[in-house]
Interface confidence: low
């Protein structure tokens, strides 16, 4: 990495420090959007008093963005043109292409609970398909 990005207090997966993990992640679930458009990826951590130290947004194994309690937002350089922070701890994807179809993960790093992960599946549809109201569904 030729650039500096913030650290985060977690490593992925779940659990940490032997504490009881009571929290749950609510996500926007499976969503579809039109090619060329924008979409907001949103997660919400509830049912825990743990401190959120960082939220990571990942697409498969690629780091998209980090929102760090110490240092604020960092967008990975390869996504700077098409990813905007927010609203809140969410992430806005712009200028969508069909290649953006896939799984996205919000990874909440908390103290003392550990790591909570939410999953969103995004399908980017060709304009004509989206206009006819097609929706992605997991069978």
């Amino acid at each position: 990495y030729p650039y500096d990005v913030p650290d985060y207090a977690g490593g992925g997966g779940s659990g940490g420090g032997g504490s009881m993990m009571t929290g749950t992640i609510e996500t926007t679930g499976n969503i579809s959007a039109e090619k060329g458009g924008s979409i907001i990826l949103q997660c919400h951590l509830s049912s825990t008093t743990a401190q959120v130290t960082q939220v990571n947004w990942e697409q498969q194994d690629q780091l998209l963005a980090i929102c760090n309690a110490d240092l604020g937002w960092h967008i990975s350089p390869s996504f700077k043109d098409r990813v905007a922070p927010g609203p809140g701890l969410g992430l806005t994807l712009q200028s969508l292409t069909v290649n953006d179809t896939g799984e996205y993960f919000c990874i909440y790093h908390t103290a003392p609970d550990g790591t909570y992960t939410g999953r969103i599946f995004l399908e980017v549809l060709e304009s004509s398909v989206a206009e006819h109201g097609a929706r992605f569904q997991i069978p």
């Epitope: 990495y1 500096d4 990005v5 913030p6 650290d7 985060y8 207090a9 977690g10 490593g11 992925g12 997966g13 779940s14 659990g15 940490g16 420090g17 130290t53 194994d61 780091l63 760090n68 309690a69 110490d70 240092l71 103290a111 550990g114 790591t115």
Partner: antibody
């Protein structure tokens, strides 16, 4: 070039105190989480403590909790480990290590400083 | 705490051999495992993180695989400079824990 240089080790009696320092250079220190890891003579590696870039997240191994304090001074590019109530089993080489940008793996390590606790 | 068990604890091999070291976690750590190489009197060196991602500057003869609880470090063709001790470390959760090490010696 990333460099981490530990200092402050030495011989101390049981119950005594030591303060280890780690001087960082060659990277933007204030953007990286940092670890202390130790290695007893002839033994394996043991993680000791972690501090996030802005010090908002601090974690300790159970074996040192309540006795050791990790801290950092980003203005001085320095990491510290204050060790109190030292025991014979704390005898080890102590390494400071930089956390990778994206995971808790440790991508750069110092050369280590030896701490010997003995009467 | 997650216990990391490495095997074997030591092995003897010759230059050019294919060497495999395994690491088992006491519970699932997803893909979050790192491998380090340490030579006598030196600091550890990161080889692989996140299970299979090669750290920059590490030769491609090193590779990592596995997820969940079982992981493998493979050296495809052992070189003279590879004789060392290798450690695995889970970076899934606090407290971060290391395996006991595997010493690779010259046969």
């Amino acid at each position: 070039e990333v460099q981490l240089v530990e200092s402050g080790g030495g011989l101390v009696q049981p119950g005594g105190s030591l303060r280890l320092s780690c001087a960082a250079s060659g990277f933007t220190f204030s953007n990286f989480g940092m670890h202390w890891v130790r290695q007893a003579p002839g033994k394996g590696l043991e993680w000791v403590a972690f501090i996030s870039s802005g010090s908002s997240s601090i974690y300790y191994a159970d074996t040192v909790k309540g006795r050791f304090t990790i801290s950092r001074d980003n203005a001085k590019n320095s990491l510290y480990l204050q060790m109190n109530s030292l025991r014979a089993e704390d005898t080890a080489v102590y390494y400071c290590a930089r956390m990778r940008l994206d995971y808790y793996a440790m991508d750069y390590w110092g050369q280590g400083t030896m701490v010997t606790v003995s009467s | 705490d997650i216990q990391m068990t490495q095997s074997p604890s030591s092995l003897s091999a010759s230059v050019g051999d294919r060497v495999t070291i395994t690491c088992r976690a006491s519970k699932s750590i997803s893909k979050y495992l790192a491998w380090y190489q340490q030579k006598p009197g030196k600091a550890p060196k990161l080889l692989i993180y996140s299970g299979s991602t090669l750290q920059s500057g590490v030769p491609s003869r090193f590779s990592g695989s596995g997820s969940g609880t079982d992981f493998t470090l493979t050296i495809s063709s052992l070189q003279p400079e590879d004789f060392a001790t290798y450690y695995c470390q889970q970076h899934n959760e606090y407290p971060w824990t290391f395996g006991g090490g595997t010493k690779v010696e010259i046969k």
